[in-house]
């Protein structure tokens, strides 16, 4: 079997809402993955599990099941959304994210994703980690790759 390549492309959009009373931030973050099947047979993308970390704390998790089948030598782009919550010990961020005196309220989030593919009963897992900028102060749609955090800090692939 040849490789199945998973490439984390970046944040596609981030939609933000607040609970003023509880100083809580809700961020719905949609990410984009490219999955390439280098084989001469179809593979099934069985599930995608993702989590988002802020300051080493997991603030959101998501799991998608039975996603798609990728044909031989084909590539598919897949979007997945992770609902995240910034509250309690991190409520100090509420003040930053809602500060009207600044235009962009970028925070650095670590995106972790694991893709499980299957073919002929064989299962394979591929994981990626990326640091991304996300604006927690307004709804934002990103050009792919636009939210990338300094490459120098990216973990080695």
């Amino acid at each position: 079997p040849r490789s199945i390549d998973v490439k984390y492309i970046g944040v596609k959009s981030a939609y933000v809402s607040y609970d003023v009373q509880k100083r809580t931030i809700y961020l719905n973050i949609t990410n984009t993955l490219n999955i390439t099947n280098n084989n001469y047979y179809s593979v099934e993308v069985e599930n995608i599990t993702a989590q988002v970390q802020f300051s080493k704390t997991v603030i959101g998790k998501a799991r998608l099941n039975n996603i798609t089948i990728i044909g031989p030598l084909d590539m598919k782009q897949i979007d997945y959304t992770v609902p995240t919550v910034i509250a309690e010990e991190m409520s100090y961020m509420y003040d930053f994210c809602t500060l009207i005196s600044i235009k962009v309220h970028n925070i650095v989030l670590m995106m972790q994703v694991t893709v499980t593919t299957t073919y002929f009963g064989h299962s394979e897992q591929i994981s990626q980690e990326r640091y991304q900028y996300v604006d927690c102060g307004r709804n934002t749609t990103y050009q792919l790759g636009q939210s990338e955090y300094l490459n120098v800090l990216q973990p080695q692939q």
């Epitope: 609970d19 009373q21 509880k22 100083r23 809580t24 809700y26 919550v85 509250a87 309690e88």
Partner: antibody
């Protein structure tokens, strides 16, 4: 230390209005929500609403929407609650309360103002 | 509105005994941010209520460790491991998950 000073009593006539004050000290006034709570003699506690002193935004219990108006004066670190069209049902102790950082529990209470509605 | 039901209404105890007060809410108190905003207060005669326990099980500063809170969802309990004279008064549970915030009817802790 945190203090919330309220006048002890207010005697008002039915149909009139009263404006209760709550002077805060010992902390940054604009950082914490101020809540108002009603307690009728020998009865339980009822949340009236709260106000964000930094911008004046309020959240009211629907039951008190037409009864209570919450305001603040940042310059004197004082919160106010105006009660209108008073009836005997409004006779109660009214507490002003400072919320915690999240505005959800009430660590600091004023001594309460006893409002007596009587002709 | 969320109805908070406390039992018992009155709780006669001997000093040194353990006391347990139950508080039940008409709907779950788990907020969409995952936190349960259930608190306990003690009101002594002629005084303002005082915060004892916040967010189910966290003791407020200065509150003795004989006070403990537990529970989840809709069922909550306040326990006093060894009742002392200064613990007598009316205990209220309160929820601030849903607006309007509401209180239980109170439980009077008194000497047997």
């Amino acid at each position: 230390q945190v203090q919330l000073q309220q006048p002890g009593t207010e005697l008002v006539k039915p149909g009139a209005l009263v404006k209760l004050s709550c002077k805060a000290s010992g902390y940054t006034f604009t950082t914490y929500w101020i809540h108002w709570v009603k307690q009728r003699p020998g009865q339980g506690l009822e949340w009236i609403g709260n106000i964000n002193p930094s911008n004046g935004n309020t959240k009211n219990n629907e039951r008190f929407k037409t009864k209570a108006t919450l305001t603040v004066d940042k310059s004197s670190s004082t919160a106010y609650m105006q009660l209108s069209s008073l009836t005997s049902e409004d006779s109660a102790v009214y507490y002003c309360v400072r919320g915690d950082y999240y505005g959800t529990s009430y660590p600091f209470w004023g001594q309460g103002t006893l409002v007596t509605v009587s002709s | 509105d969320v109805v908070m039901t406390q039992t018992p209404l009155s709780l006669p105890v001997s000093l040194g005994d353990q006391a347990s007060i139950s508080c039940r809410s008409s709907q779950s108190l788990v907020h969409s941010n995952g936190i349960t905003y259930l608190h306990w207060y003690l009101q002594k005669p002629g005084q303002s209520p005082k915060l004892l326990i916040y967010k189910v099980s966290n003791r407020f500063s200065g509150v003795p460790d004989r006070f403990s809170g537990s529970g989840s969802g809709t069922d909550f309990t306040l326990k006093i491991s060894r009742v002392e004279a200064e613990d007598l008064g009316v205990y209220f549970c309160s929820q601030s998950t849903h607006v309007p915030y509401t209180f239980g009817g109170g439980t009077k802790l008194e000497i047997k």
